[in-house]
Each structure stands twice: as C-alpha cells, then as structure tokens.
C-alpha cells in the first residue's frame, strides 16, 4: 500500500486518507466559471463545459449555478469547499452523486444551484422533480 515515508506526510489539508491508508484524489469537476447558456425549460442539461479540472483541495465538491434574468441565462461550473457558503448559500447536497438543481431566492433573477461529489457530476445538471429527494416515493426506492 502507501509507503510509510509517504504516509507520514499526508496529514495536511491537501490530503484526505481513510482507515485503510488509501488517499483520496481530489474531485474532478467541470470548471468553466460563468458561461452563457441555452439551457432553459428542460428536465436536465449538459454543461457544455470542455474544461475538467482537478479541484485544488480534496474536500472540494462540484458546483453548478444556473441563473436567468431579463437579459440572459448563465451556467457557472466550479469546485468549492462545502464547509463554506457559495453565493451566500450552504451546499446542502454536497454528498449527492448527482447535481440536482434547487431553486434559491435571489431578487431580480431565477437562481438554481446544485452540488455533488462524483467525478464531473456538474456536467449534467438536473431540474426534473422526479430526482428531488423530497419526493417520498423516491426516498422509498433509495432506502429499500
């Protein structure tokens, strides 16, 4: 497994280890910052972001932010630490493998945000209600 001389050095904020000594590679996320988007009135959309980045820190997760105002629609894709708010909102769904969009209250625009923790999971953003875990039927399926 991990050589002992390496293991001694892994206790810093850039490294996450498990009980078996495995080391977590940082998340791979789509990272195009803010781009104009054509994603509108769809159950799900692809980010159309061609840049996949290795997140800077292993605790970071993938985030997508969809915004619509009178002038345009934008989609933001980034890595972010779920311990810290993003756009003043807590990343409640950071452990989710899928990026399920949740609407947030922002004056003057429609604002949706999602976060997730599987590789490149912010490439496919999901608006459809059928994925929403507040749906009791879905919860039944998940926990069966």
């Amino acid at each position: 497994t991990i050589p002992p001389h390496v293991q001694k050095s892994v206790n810093n904020d850039m490294i996450v280890t498990d009980n078996n000594g495995a080391v977590k590679f940082p998340q791979l996320c789509k990272f195009c910052d803010v781009r104009f988007s054509t994603c509108d009135n769809q159950k799900s959309c692809m980010s159309n972001c061609s840049i996949t980045s290795i997140c800077e820190k292993p605790q970071e997760v993938c985030v997508a932010v969809w915004r619509k105002n009178d002038e345009n629609i934008t989609l933001e894709t980034v890595c972010h630490d779920p311990k810290l708010p993003y756009h003043d909102f807590i990343l409640e769904d950071a452990a989710s493998p899928k990026c399920i969009m949740k609407e947030k209250k922002k004056p003057g625009e429609t604002f949706f945000m999602c976060s997730c923790s599987s590789d490149e999971c912010n490439d496919n953003i999901i608006f459809s209600e059928e994925y929403n875990t507040s749906n009791p039927d879905l919860l039944l399926v998940i926990f069966q």
Epitope: T1, I2, D18, N20, G21, A22, V23, K24, F25, P26, Q27, L28, T52, D119
Partner: nanobody
Framework: EVQLLESGGGLVQPGGSLRLSCAAS????????MAWVRQAPGKGLEWVSR????????YYADSVKGRFTISRDNSKNTLYLQMNSLRAEDTAVYYC????????????WGQGTLVTVSS
C-alpha cells in the same frame, strides 16, 4: 500481490525533459485508473496527473498543465509521465498510484523515483 515500480528519474537541467515509467503487476492494469503524485523535499503530497483506465481521459494539476503528459500502455501494464520544460520547482519524488475502485481513492503506491531539476 500488487506491485508498482517507478523508474526514469534523475538529474536534469532546467528546461530539460524526462520520461518516467511505472511497471505494474499483481492486478488487471487495464481496469484501473492510475495517477502520478509527487512530494517535494520537506513538503506534502501534490497530485500531478490522473488517467482513466481506457487511457483516453487525462487530467492535470494547473502547475504542470501543458508541460507534462500522462499516458499508459495497457498491453505492457505500464504507466508513463512525459515531463518537458522542467523547472526547479518540479524537483520531487514521483510516485505512481492505483485507484481502488474507479472512485478516486488510491490504495497502492510505488516506492517513488527522484527527479532533480538543477543547473
């Protein structure tokens, strides 16, 4: 038993090139993601690059993007790291590592090969 054996390190001048190899055995190499990680003297680990099992999708840390190229030859069970335009700050021990289950957790590491960039 899983074994990873790195080679190809050495002393090189700034601006020079090196090609690291990692010979893998004890597992089905073609089924696992692989990565290169480095540790500079007195510093922590830094992830350098990762390659998917199919060899097509590759990922790089910003510090090496455009200079380093990761590749693999699944028929030879070997992982490579081509390092060009080397800088003093690339001086480190370079390790190859094997993904546990395509989930970003790397459970087996080689013993490392030292790359020294100095004039």
């Amino acid at each position: 038993e899983v074994q990873l054996l790195e080679s190809g390190g050495g002393l090189v001048q700034p601006g020079g090139s090196l090609r690291l190899s990692c010979a893998a055995s004890g597992f089905t190499f073609s089924e696992y993601d692989m990565a290169w990680v480095r540790q500079a003297p007195g510093k922590g680990l830094e992830w350098v690059s990762r390659i998917r099992s199919d060899g097509v999708r590759t990922y790089y840390a910003d510090s090496v993007k455009g200079r380093f190229t990761i590749s693999r030859d699944n028929s030879k069970n070997t992982l490579y790291l081509q390092m060009n335009s080397l800088r003093a700050e690339d001086t480190a021990v370079y390790y190859c590592a094997k993904d546990r289950a395509k989930n970003g957790w790397f459970d087996y590491w080689g013993q490392g090969t030292l790359v020294t960039v100095s004039s």
